[in-house]
């Protein structure tokens, strides 16, 4: 479902979108994921924000915790018990990193329709979560894990040596949060709760990287943050498993790393449980191109975790790193030793694998010229999982359900033929068993949530379709919309133009190409989206591309580890090439071509405006990385190696921003960065500025104090506002 | 509005068994999830059991091997076998939706006392 463009009676009454459509969010949609509490049960919030119950089976719903309660702690989120006795509410919410926060918490009870008094929860605390059966809790507080048996008992501490910045225990520190997990946790409960197992970090001997937080005091504050930077030290990690029926009876004990991990500096991936006695880990080499999935059971005679050599699979790459952008976890089957994990395949093309024994006699579950995405469930007769299987678009999700009770195995397209114009990108959330599952659909229409039945597929009732948004959009002259590809050098390069609404192939337009290119990242989708870019074709008249090039995901292996040790090379040329394509269409006025990133994609940004093609008249850089040495290892170095001289040295300082500062000379290159970046720090910009300075070429640029890698709040208008400008005072558009 | 009524408690020695029913009516069907909760003198009022609609059952801790819950969904009936009984199990017990609906509509419980 795309809202009707212009071709309609009322062609007077439509108006362009406007900068302040996009500035207050006019046209944002909403997704319902129900809150599974059961296989057929599920908890949402009310728009007067009741939580209710809802019954799929019965029809029925009714509330279990009032507006009135929540209101009364300030309450912005809320967990029931597994045991449905209690509900945390959590306030006071205060953003730490990306995924991480701190908050306060209440426990109510809801037998007896009051808070819970008595050894009350420390504030403020960083991580808190129910047991998965009854209503144990662990929290962390102070980087220290505390345990209780019931909410109004007394905690057990179960670590000691916590310490800001030096020992995270049960939440990552900003690396792995970043990075590798990526969570705000490190803890994990066994599925019935009898186990608990916690990451410990320690961060002692990493460097610290110190910028100015400048607040409303007379002196700026300094933030400290551990952060490793390519080929820095890194944290050390070790993983734990204490027992919460008797914690203080044996005490945690450590789970062991696998020998041909722990010989070299590594990182620990994932920990999945199996069953109450039998635990998953996940290690990656430093080196990221060797990962060791190793599967331990509880020694009741020891009360130790055994790791036998048997039970190590290991994964390499030879072409690359290890996985896609993260190594894929494992799915366990009902035998509890057995797994279905996402890995590249001999023809280079991320695919479903059955693990029985060893990874050498994996049986392949899915095969092609295409990639899957990710398992969402497995049960005793079916896997679901996502790919970009349907018509050969890589930019699409669909829903697939194998049926893995029957030989051979049958596939069925869930999602494939719903509502096939408007949903071509889906994601799904599955009640326990699978007995319902709610679909997501992103677009390329009006993004609309479902219900629908595990067992026959059949849809039951629409959870949301963002009726009001269509309406909004009615008298809205939307851009076009194309995904196409183009092919070039035995390369396909997938784009996404965005097109003004009287969009006329005989006339001549500006160009706006939006990059992001990092690795493994994909920009071409087949999404709902009313952004900022939407606004520039729409009221400005402008041509917008988005190009998926060399590094970019779910193509295969091949494009995937093209920058491979080469990062800032092929992802630009694409871009490049791909400009060169849209000058041949002949609608593109090439002496009004820009480019524009954020992150990664200001790096790209960057590069391209710097390469000397004359090309692009003007550009953005967002926050961009400017050097690799600047940024974090984990990221860095799994795709560019170490920057030392027996491994890759030469090419981190090859692929410098700043070493390009001359050829910034015919461009406009606007460059903007928050001074409180905690992930691309401002050193990158400060760099190129300085680089740009020494070189004697001119350049505007904007900082946004106390701002982070977002640019959230008021900056955020300020940006677009600002950026805007830029782009109408390149092309000559008049204000 | 659902009526709950709630029926065979009594006074029993400990050790001994009681089971306890619960006839649901009303505009809500009794095959939405329910529990059993109970309050004893001078204490809040806390769960003993739930059960699903699909049948699976959760239990508190203090009870697990000695209840059990079970349903009836043509009677629209729910039922707790209470054995092994202890003085400590000595309460006012309840049926309700698990977790209880708000505002909570609680019916007149059935008295179990259980003597040494």
């Known amino acids: 479902l795309r809202p009707s463009r212009v071709h309609n009676s009322e062609e007077n009454t439509m108006r362009a979108l406007t900068l302040k459509d996009i500035l207050n969010g006019t046209f944002s949609y909403k997704t319902f994921f129900p809150n599974w509490i059961s296989g057929q049960e599920y908890l949402h919030q009310s728009a007067d924000n009741n939580i209710v119950l809802y019954n799929i089976e019965t029809g029925q719903s009714y509330t279990i915790l009032s507006n009135r309660t929540m209101k009364s702690v300030n309450a912005s989120n809320y967990g029931l018990s597994p045991d449905r006795q209690f509900v945390y509410l959590e306030s006071d919410y205060s953003k730490l990193w990306r995924y991480s926060y701190t908050a306060t918490y209440y426990i109510y009870d809801l037998s007896n329709g009051e808070f819970v008094r008595g050894n009350e929860l420390p504030r403020p605390i960083q991580y808190l979560c129910w047991s998965p059966v009854g209503s144990k809790l662990a929290y962390v507080y102070q980087n220290n894990i505390y345990l209780k048996q019931r909410p109004g008992d007394p905690p057990f501490q179960i670590t000691f040596n916590g310490r800001e910045n030096k020992i995270f225990n049960g939440i990552p520190d900003w690396v792995y949060e970043e990075e590798m997990l990526p969570t705000k946790y490190a803890l994990w409960w066994s599925p019935n709760g009898k186990f608990l197992a916690y990451a410990e970090f320690n961060d002692k001997d990493i460097p610290v990287i110190a910028y100015s937080y400048y607040g409303d005091e007379q002196y700026p504050r300094t933030i400290n943050i551990p952060y490793p930077k390519a080929g820095a030290k890194n944290p050390v990690v070790r993983i734990f498993i204490i027992d919460t029926t008797y914690p203080a009876y044996v005490g945690p004990q450590e789970v062991p790393v696998p020998a041909m991990i722990a010989s070299s500096d590594y990182y620990f991936s994932w920990l999945t449980w199996v069953t109450d006695e039998r635990v998953c880990l996940q290690w990656l080499k430093r080196v990221q191109n060797v990962s060791v999935l190793s599967i331990c059971d509880f020694r009741e005679d020891w009360q130790t975790w055994d790791c036998p050599k048997t039970q190590e699979h290991i994964e390499e790459s030879r072409t690359g790193w290890a996985g896609g952008f993260f190594v894929s976890r494992p799915v366990f089957s009902y035998d509890a030793i057995s797994y279905y994990k996402i890995f590249s395949d001999k023809d280079g093309y991320k695919h479903i694998h059955y693990i029985k024994d060893t990874v050498e006699n994996a049986i392949q579950i899915t095969s092609g010229k295409w990639e899957a995405i990710n398992i969402f469930r497995v049960t005793q007769d079916s896997l679901f999982y996502s790919s970009n299987e349907f018509e050969e678009y890589p930019g699409r999700r669909n829903i697939y359900r194998i049926s893995i009770g029957s030989y051979p195995p049958s596939k069925k397209c869930v999602t494939c033929h719903l509502r096939k114009e408007r949903c071509q990108y889906y994601t799904a959330s599955f009640s326990d068993y699978a007995k319902y599952y709610a679909l997501v659909c992103y677009g390329p229409g009006i993004p609309i949530s479902t219900l629908h039945d595990g067992r026959t597929d059949q849809e039951i009732k629409i959870l949301e379709e963002n009726k009001e948004l269509e309406n909004a959009l009615k008298n809205i002259q939307l851009p076009k919309e194309e995904i196409k590809k183009l092919e070039v050098d035995e390369i396909t390069l997938w784009y996404k133009m965005i097109l003004p609404p009287q969009f006329d192939r005989s006339k001549k337009y500006p160009l706006l190409i939006q990059v992001y290119g990092g690795p493994c990242s994909q920009s071409v989708r087949s999404v709902f989206a009313v952004n900022w870019i939407s606004y520039l074709a729409s009221k400005e008249g402008m041509v917008i591309a988005l190009v998926d090039g060399r590094g970019t995901a779910f193509q295969g292996d091949k494009l995937l580890y093209a920058v491979y040790r080469k990062l800032g090379v092929y992802e630009v040329e694409d871009q490049i090439t791909a400009v060169r394509k849209f000058i041949e269409m002949g609608f593109i006025d090439e002496k009004r071509i820009a480019i524009w990133g954020w992150s990664y994609g200001g790096y790209v940004s960057s590069l391209a405006l710097a390469s000397g093609t004359g090309l692009f008249k003007c550009g953005i850089a967002v926050a961009p990385v400017s050097s690799w040495e600047y940024y974090a290892s984990v990221y860095t170095e799994r795709f560019m190696g170490l920057p030392t001289k027996d491994d890759n040295l030469e090419h981190y300082k090859n692929s410098t921003v700043m070493a390009r500062a001359e050829y910034f000379r015919n461009v406009d290159y606007l460059l903007i960065h928050g001074t409180a970046d905690d992930n691309v720090h401002f050193q990158n910009s400060a760099q190129i500025a300085k680089a740009l300075v020494n070189a004697q070429v001119d350049f505007q640029a904007m900082w946004y104090s106390d701002q982070n890698h977002g640019l959230s709040g008021l900056s955020t208008n300020h940006l677009y506002t600002h950026m805007t400008h830029f782009l109408k005072q390149c092309f000559s558009l008049s204000d | 509005q659902v009526q709950l009524q709630e029926s065979g408690g009594g006074l029993v020695q400990a050790g001994g068994s009681l089971r306890l029913s619960c006839a649901a009516s009303?505009?809500?069907?009794?095959?939405?999830?329910m529990g059993w909760y109970r309050q004893a003198p001078g204490k809040q009022r806390e769960l003993v059991a739930g059960?699903?609609?699909?049948?699976?059952?959760k239990y508190v801790e203090s009870v697990k091997g000695r209840f059990t819950i079970s349903r009836d969904n043509a009677k629209n009936t729910v039922h707790l076998q209470m054995n092994s009984l202890k003085v400590e199990d000595t309460a006012v017990y309840y049926c309700?939706?698990?977790?209880?609906?708000?505002?909570?509509?609680w019916g007149q419980g059935t008295q179990v006392t259980v003597s040494s």
């Open positions: 059960i699903l609609s699909d049948g699976t059952t």
């Open positions: 309700n939706f698990f977790p209880p609906p708000v505002p909570a509509s």
């Open positions: 009303g505009t809500m069907s009794s095959i939405n999830a």
